[in-house]
């Protein structure tokens, strides 16, 4: 009984289509595969950024796989052929591994790359990224930002740079159609007549860096002799009400400070008849139902009520 063997895939390679970190892993079938014509051959693919503790593992019948990587580091991958037990009248047969690596040859020393990169998606509408120039770079150094997300044919360069002393230190992005809930890739590279500049790569999802506008139209309503309802409206813009969390700060008579986090646009406050002044501010953040992370808005304008009327009817300001 001859032992069944299968070859590893051929020409296993990592292809960079120029999408700033979204790479293609592709391979050709093993030689002599048609011995197993009646059988569905599978491939087990393992890949990771160099330095990562864990491999991502995929089992596929295809000859390619696509995923995002951190191009600041190298990438390593390996693949082998799997013959399921149905094909071999016994146990699963695996080929040896085919291995490959990919990295972008770094130019310049690490200190020349941009520092303190910060990107904020204001009100889920306007993306703005800012950075500081690399350490010790001369004023002739200029940085350029490129970005890509699935849906764009190719990486695009920023067309509206924020400048300081003639240097690009940020980018105001145009309207980004259908760009949330997918990886957004950025490369900031640079040029200088003096020395080579190290490129930096960043990946995030836009819904996770949203900074909403603060809530508006803060009002008071007396619910009962000992309860006041605080109300506000969601900020203007595209973010739906179901996506907000709120933080409230309430001050009674310049002494008591109450802070609370709520999911709705109301908060009921227990008060005493002795309360003479009530002030509150609210800020908003995108909640866990709509993103994995977010940035608190600025605080709203303060809304206060003082005087005898606090114990009466509806209070509006």
């Amino acid at each position: 009984d001859t032992e069944i063997k299968v070859n590893p895939p051929q020409d296993f390679e990592i292809v960079d289509p120029g999408y700033l970190g979204y790479l293609y892993l592709q391979w050709q079938p093993p030689l002599s595969l048609d011995h197993f014509k009646e059988c569905t051959v599978e491939y087990e693919l393992k890949y990771r950024n160099i330095g990562s503790e864990t491999w991502k593992t995929i089992i596929t019948k295809n000859l390619h796989y696509k995923d995002g990587f951190d191009l600041n580091k190298g990438i390593e991958a390996k693949i082998h052929t799997l013959l399921p037990w149905q094909c071999t009248n016994g146990s699963e047969v695996q080929s040896s591994w085919a291995e490959t690596t990919y990295w972008i040859s770094p130019q310049g020393i690490p200190e020349t790359k941009v520092q303190d990169m910060d990107c904020v998606y204001y009100n889920w509408q306007y993306l703005l990224c800012s950075w500081k120039p690399g350490i010790g770079v001369l004023l002739d150094t200029n940085y350029n930002l490129f970005y890509w997300y699935e849906g764009l044919d190719h990486a695009l360069q920023c067309v509206d740079y924020i400048k300081a002393d003639g240097q690009n230190i940020g980018c105001r992005f145009p309207y980004l159609e259908a760009s949330d809930y997918k990886d957004f890739y950025i490369c900031v590279n640079g040029s200088s007549e003096n020395k080579p500049i190290r490129s930096s790569y960043f990946t995030f999802q836009l819904q996770n860096i949203v900074k909403p506008l603060p809530p508006v139209y803060l009002t008071f309503t007396r619910e009962s002799s000992c309860e006041i309802k605080l109300k506000w409206s969601i900020p203007l813009g595209p973010i739906p009400a179901r996506c907000f969390d709120y933080e409230i700060e309430i001050r009674e008579d310049d002494t008591t400070l109450v802070t609370a986090t709520v999911e709705n646009e109301t908060y009921t406050l227990k008060t005493t008849n002795e309360t003479r002044q009530l002030c509150f501010v609210v800020r908003s953040k995108v909640n866990i139902y709509c993103s994995d992370d977010g940035i608190w808005s600025e605080w709203s304008d303060k809304q206060c009520w003082e005087g005898e009327d606090l114990s009466k009817k509806t209070l509006l300001r």
Epitope: Q10, E13, V15, Q26, P29, L31, H35
Partner: antibody
Framework: EVKLVESGGGLVKPGGSLKLSCAAS????????MSWVRQTPEKRLEWVAT????????YYPDSVKGRFTISRDNAKNNLYLQMSSLRSEDTALYYC???????????WGQGTSVTVSS | DIVMTQSQKFMSTSVGDRVSVTCRAS??????VAWYQQKPGQSPKSLIY???YRYSGVPDRFTGSGSGTDFTLTISNVQSEDLAEYFC?????????FGGGTKLEIR
């Protein structure tokens, strides 16, 4: 429909250089390995070079290694063969061929003629 | 290098006949053999891969067989348009090598 169109052939002196191109259409170019094969005046077929879909792997016979370079531009769907230090025995009709998923060649261009003569 | 030998340079046949073109490899190439057809004045056309599998669009009168070192391309019910030269090729290992070709003549 898969289409491969070679160009760039011509008459060149021994020791000279020439760059052949192959424009591909009708398939996802970057997913396929590509080869150059030549046919000598005696009608023998000779494999010249192969490149993988992403361009990471290149293969040559000893007869052209160090003189010929195969490359590709996946953004333009173009395959190239840079030939230098040409010899009279390089005279042939040069075909561009797509490598199928079993490493055979499943589609061929119409060829471009290269003549090396003083 | 693996040498692919097509011992018959020419073969003569008649329309409707059955003809077999043979190819021998100098070492084991498993089933990693392809066959190509080249009609006069045209570029080669792919017929068979993996020794016995027809490319789509290839008439079923073309049949490939063999493994290891001996391979055969059989054309049953030969048609006048089969007038061509037939080449075998191994792709089991680099360098890829072709047979010298067998010219089929129709009587």
């Amino acid at each position: 429909e898969v289409k491969l169109v070679e160009s760039g052939g011509g008459l060149v002196k021994p020791g000279g250089s020439l760059k052949l191109s192959c424009a591909a259409s009708g398939f996802t170019f970057s997913s396929y390995g590509m080869s150059w094969v030549r046919q000598t005046p005696e009608k023998r077929l000779e494999w010249v070079a192969t490149i993988s879909g992403g361009g990471s792997y290149t293969y040559y016979p000893d007869s052209v290694k160090g003189r010929f370079t195969i490359s590709r531009d996946n953004a333009k769907n173009n395959l190239y063969l840079q030939m230098s230090s040409l010899r009279s025995e390089d005279t042939a009709l040069y075909y561009c061929a797509r490598r199928d998923l079993r490493s055979a060649m499943d589609h061929w261009g119409q060829g471009t003629s290269v003549t090396v003569s003083s | 290098d693996i040498v692919m030998t097509q011992s018959q340079k020419f073969m003569s046949t008649s329309v409707g006949d059955r003809v077999s073109v043979t190819c021998r490899a100098s070492q084991n190439v498993d089933i990693n053999v392809a066959w190509y057809q080249q009609k006069p004045g045209q570029s080669p056309k792919s017929l068979i891969y993996s020794a016995s599998y027809r490319y789509s669009g290839v008439p079923d009168r073309f049949t490939g067989s063999g493994s290891g070192t001996d391979f055969t391309l059989t054309i049953s019910n030969v048609q006048s348009e089969d007038l061509a030269e037939y080449f075998c090729q191994q792709y089991n290992s680099y360098p890829l090598t072709f047979g010298g070709g067998t010219k089929l003549e129709i009587r």
